[in-house]
């Protein structure tokens, strides 16, 4: 039931996960790991943020964007093949057993090798099938890699969830508002 | 607002089964835990199981866990409880919860011949 | 299993008083521990979470504390409204499970 992201080695990953703070400065949890949401807390944890601050990271992993505003999406920069899997983004709302969990998958595809015009020649000995399928797919000027793999269906439920997902005020921690993407 | 209505309840023959559900509103479903608490009549609180509609992983109180079995169905936002092989002892009233900070109403199950 | 033990099962007190119940895990749960308030006919309602934080919303007569094994909640001033059940519970590890729960009247 994971949402499917792509890149291409070499690109930078973008894996989003956002809530809504309570209020301005009221900021909730949030850890990223590797592998599937565990039941409790992130495995493999890549990238940690408290109350205040991001205050655990390891490279390659950052946020780019103002998690103080609750955009909590995670970065991965110059991915490789090894990077690919299943991620959680876990929203630690306060409560018991209060947090949303979202599992995202990430598909890491091989870069696509553009041969420069001079070259063809050699490309196509070195590479025999590679020019008879140009054509058939994407643009090759197509760098969509990290946006989600998802049909209008599925944009809609996505579209849904968003002005669904608010969570009461009390309970847990201090109960954030939340809407995921 | 978050919600949770429990339905299907009612009287059973021992040996029989029922399967109850746990219609879930006010957030997105597949990102929270649910988890089953019963409550026998004048007794305490016992916890069931629970299960992440996200991904349908489960887990079981080792007592009732080859008499539950948890479910989801996505489309309809709701979980459900199957309990079979009924006895008299698990008459009591059977309560969902998000997590276990927002709680649906309850409902009676009662099992008698 | 981890087993909680709550006591008392059972405790009257005057509107005012101050009233403690206790629950201890049969291991360390390092402190994830939750009580919860019960009236009659009721679901449950959670009041403290992680054995010291409390909900937001709930008064802040109610309080808890402890760690490892053992466990606390207070309520500093009894209310007429306070008149409830009380659970406690461990959610460290599966299975969860409840203390026995205590029975709060009036004097």
């Known amino acids: 039931s994971e949402v499917e992201y792509r890149a291409e080695v070499g690109q930078n990953a973008y894996l989003p996960c956002f809530y809504t703070p309570a209020a301005p400065g009221n900021l909730v949890p949030v850890c990223w790991g590797k592998g599937a949401c565990p039941v409790f807390e992130c495995g493999n944890v890549v990238l940690r943020t408290d109350e205040r601050d991001v205050n655990y990271w390891t490279s390659r992993y950052w946020l780019n964007g103002d998690f103080r505003k609750g955009d909590v999406s995670l970065t991965i920069e110059n991915v490789t093949l090894a990077d690919s899997g299943i991620y959680c983004c876990r929203i630690q709302i306060p409560g018991i057993m209060n947090d949303e969990k979202f599992n995202l998958k990430l598909v890491i595809k091989p870069a696509k090798v553009t041969p420069a015009p001079t070259r063809q020649r050699d490309f196509t000995a070195a590479f025999p099938r590679m020019l008879t399928t140009r054509g058939h797919g994407p643009a090759e000027t197509q760098t969509l890699g990290s946006l989600p793999d998802i049909n209008l269906t599925q944009i809609s439920t996505l579209a849904n969830e968003l002005r669904d997902s608010r969570l009461a005020n009390d309970l847990r921690d201090s109960g954030a508002t939340i809407r995921i993407g | 607002e978050v919600q949770l209505v429990e339905s299907g309840g009612g009287l059973v023959q021992p040996g029989g089964s029922l399967r109850l559900s746990c219609a879930a509103s006010?957030?997105?479903?597949?990102?929270?835990?649910i988890n089953w608490v019963r409550q026998a009549p004048g007794k305490g609180l016992v916890w069931i199981g629970w299960?992440?509609?996200?991904?349908?992983?489960?887990k079981y109180t080792p007592s009732l866990k080859d008499q539950a079995t948890l479910s989801t169905d996505l489309a309809k936002n709701t979980a459900y409880l199957q309990m079979n092989s009924l006895r008299a002892e698990d008459t009591a009233v059977y309560f969902c919860?998000?997590?276990?900070?927002?709680w649906g109403q309850g409902t009676l199950v009662t099992v008698s011949s | 299993d981890i087993q909680m033990t709550q006591s008392p099962s059972s405790l009257s007190a005057s509107v005012g008083d101050r009233v403690t119940i206790t629950c201890k895990a049969s291991?360390?749960?390092?402190?994830?521990l939750g009580w919860f308030q019960q009236k009659p006919g009721k679901a449950p309602k959670t009041l403290i979470y992680?054995?010291?934080r409390l909900v937001d919303g709930v008064p802040s007569r109610f309080s808890g504390s402890g760690s490892g094994q053992d466990y606390t909640f207070t309520i500093s001033s009894l209310q007429p409204e306070d008149i409830a059940t009380y659970y406690c519970?461990?959610?460290?590890?599966?299975?969860?499970?409840f203390g026995q729960g205590t029975k709060l009247e009036i004097k």
């Open positions: 006010g957030y997105t479903f597949t990102s929270s835990d």
């Open positions: 299960i992440f509609p996200g991904d349908g992983s489960t």
């Open positions: 519970l461990q959610y460290d590890e599966f299975p969860l499970t």
């Open positions: 291991q360390d749960i390092n402190s994830y």
């Open positions: 919860a998000r997590g276990l900070d927002y």
């Open positions: 992680r054995a010291d």
